[in-house]
């Protein structure tokens, strides 16, 4: 049907609150501009975390988003979400849209469960 | 015969490397001595992490194991594993045996995936 989007089922954020995971799609077609959206699912609600459009020239995305970054290569996007805290633990879905040229295709991954553990504060140095 | 053993599917270890989770079984029967074993599954292999026998009097277990502790109440055991590091991330299964009096029953949970993130070391205080 639509394009197939694959992403890992589980990722652990680092103790700095950084989680990285790939989002791949197939078939890749001959696409000049690809839009990637990261959504967070809570209960039955989806909220957009960040979105960007990659082109052949613009292979680094999410420049408008302080918490997201990503690099694009062929049909794979390496996503990084930073600034995560324990309350941000949840299911993060990768949506891929082949925007240009037509035809338009859209696909959604099954989601990556990101687990975040807040670090213990370091003891004060007297 | 088998008994039904339930345990959570996922638990996050704290930043101190401590993971706690319940292990419950049913039917509980009228049992004086219950043996609880925690096993770690890696690939197709099971290794014993710790084991203890609870009685009406001995409701605190795993005294021989520095990394395990647990309390027993009716048909529920609250398990705690400590000293965990990122390499210990894995599937931990709770096995329950109703040892005495007969009849003997045994059951195994589906496992709890414990995720462990190593904390960043605190900066040295000069």
């Amino acid at each position: 049907e639509a394009i197939q989007v694959t992403q890992p089922s589980v990722v652990l954020a680092s103790s700095h609150g950084v989680a990285s995971f790939p989002c791949e799609y197939s078939p890749s077609h001959n696409t000049d501009e690809v839009r990637v959206t990261v959504l967070r699912q809570t209960n039955d609600q989806m909220t957009e975390v960040c979105a960007t459009t990659f082109t052949e020239k613009n292979t680094v995305g999410f420049l408008d988003y302080p918490f997201c970054s990503g690099t694009f290569n062929e049909s794979r996007v390496n996503l990084t979400i930073q600034g995560l805290r324990a309350v941000d633990t949840g299911l993060y879905l990768c949506k891929v849209e082949l925007m240009y040229p037509p035809p338009y295709f859209v696909g959604m991954g099954n989601g990556t469960q990101i687990y975040v553990i807040d670090p213990e504060p370091c003891p004060d140095s007297d | 015969e088998a008994i039904q053993v339930t345990q959570p599917s996922v638990v996050l270890a704290s930043s101190h490397g401590v993971a706690s989770f319940p292990c419950e079984y049913s039917p509980s029967h009228n049992t004086d001595e219950v043996r609880v074993t925690v096993l770690r599954q890696t690939n197709d292999q099971m290794t014993e992490v710790c084991a203890t026998t609870f009685t009406e009097k001995n409701t605190v277990g795993f005294l021989d194991y520095p990394f395990c502790s647990g309390t027993f109440n009716e048909s529920r055991v609250n398990l705690t594993i400590q000293g965990l590091r990122a390499v210990d991330t894995g599937l931990y299964l709770c096995k329950v045996e109703l040892m005495y009096p007969p009849p003997y029953f045994v059951g195994m949970g589906n496992g709890t995936q414990i995720y462990v993130i190593d904390p960043e070391p605190c900066p040295d205080s000069d």
Epitope: E33, M99, V106 | -
Partner: antibody
């Protein structure tokens, strides 16, 4: 709420040029390709062309090739249609539209080519 | 270019009637299991409104009396029970390849 608003229509002399604008709001403009479509009075819909999200790519219907230019300014959330060498048969309502699985159209702007 | 031919060009019907409009493409508009054929409703002086996308998916907010079917080259828009607000012109559109093309339209009038 997604909105597309066309402007710049009016009366144009045959042989003249027109530049239509389409102001977008309510969404990330730079993320989506936009089309221009026109409709002559009492007639059907006719696709003119498309511009890519970044503005780096355009495609036009054969009949408009060489006479039309679609451009966009992502910093201003605005799309443009330049049509040259106008003739009477270019009289139409011109629409900009975002055509994906959810479609958004502007209200259209009427261009009349007449002397 | 892909040509789209709608039939009939116009029809007269009464409120409550079941109405069927067909759209035939000069070549298949299917690709990777998806049909790139959409249906629009247009009323005089208004912009077109998307009813059905990808041949059979109902656009959000569109009444369920509208349905679409078909694949390849033959497609159908059905209005199960015509309502007064449904009297309008209907267009099919293909978005598989550039140039996008529209059918010539079907005008649904009151009998």
């Amino acid at each position: 709420e997604v909105q597309l608003v066309e402007s710049g229509g009016g009366l144009v002399q045959p042989g003249g040029s027109l530049r239509l604008s389409c102001a977008a709001s309510g969404y990330t403009f730079s993320g989506y390709a936009i089309h221009w479509v026109r409709q002559a009075p009492g007639k059907g819909l006719e696709w003119i062309g498309i511009i890519s999200p970044s503005g780096g790519g355009t495609k036009y219907a054969q009949k408009f090739q060489g006479r039309v230019t679609i451009s966009r300014d992502n910093s201003k959330n605005t799309l443009y249609l330049q049509l040259n060498s106008l003739r009477a048969e270019d009289t139409a309502v011109y629409y900009c539209a975002r055509l994906y699985d959810v479609a958004y159209w502007g209200q259209g702007t009427l261009v009349t080519v007449s002397s | 270019d892909i040509q789209l031919t709608q039939s009939p060009s116009s029809l007269s019907a009464s409120v409550g009637d079941r109405v069927t409009i067909t759209c035939r493409a000069s070549q298949s508009v299917d690709f990777h299991g998806k049909s790139f054929l959409h249906w629009y409703q247009q009323k005089p002086g208004k912009a077109p409104k998307l009813l059905i996308y990808d041949a059979s998916s109902l656009e959000s907010g569109v009444p369920s009396r509208f349905s679409g079917s078909g694949s390849g080259t033959d497609f159908t828009l059905t209005i199960s029970s015509l309502q007064p607000e449904d009297f309008a012109t209907y267009y099919c559109e293909q978005s598989l390849e550039v140039p996008f093309t529209f059918g010539q339209g079907t005008k649904v009038e009151i009998k």
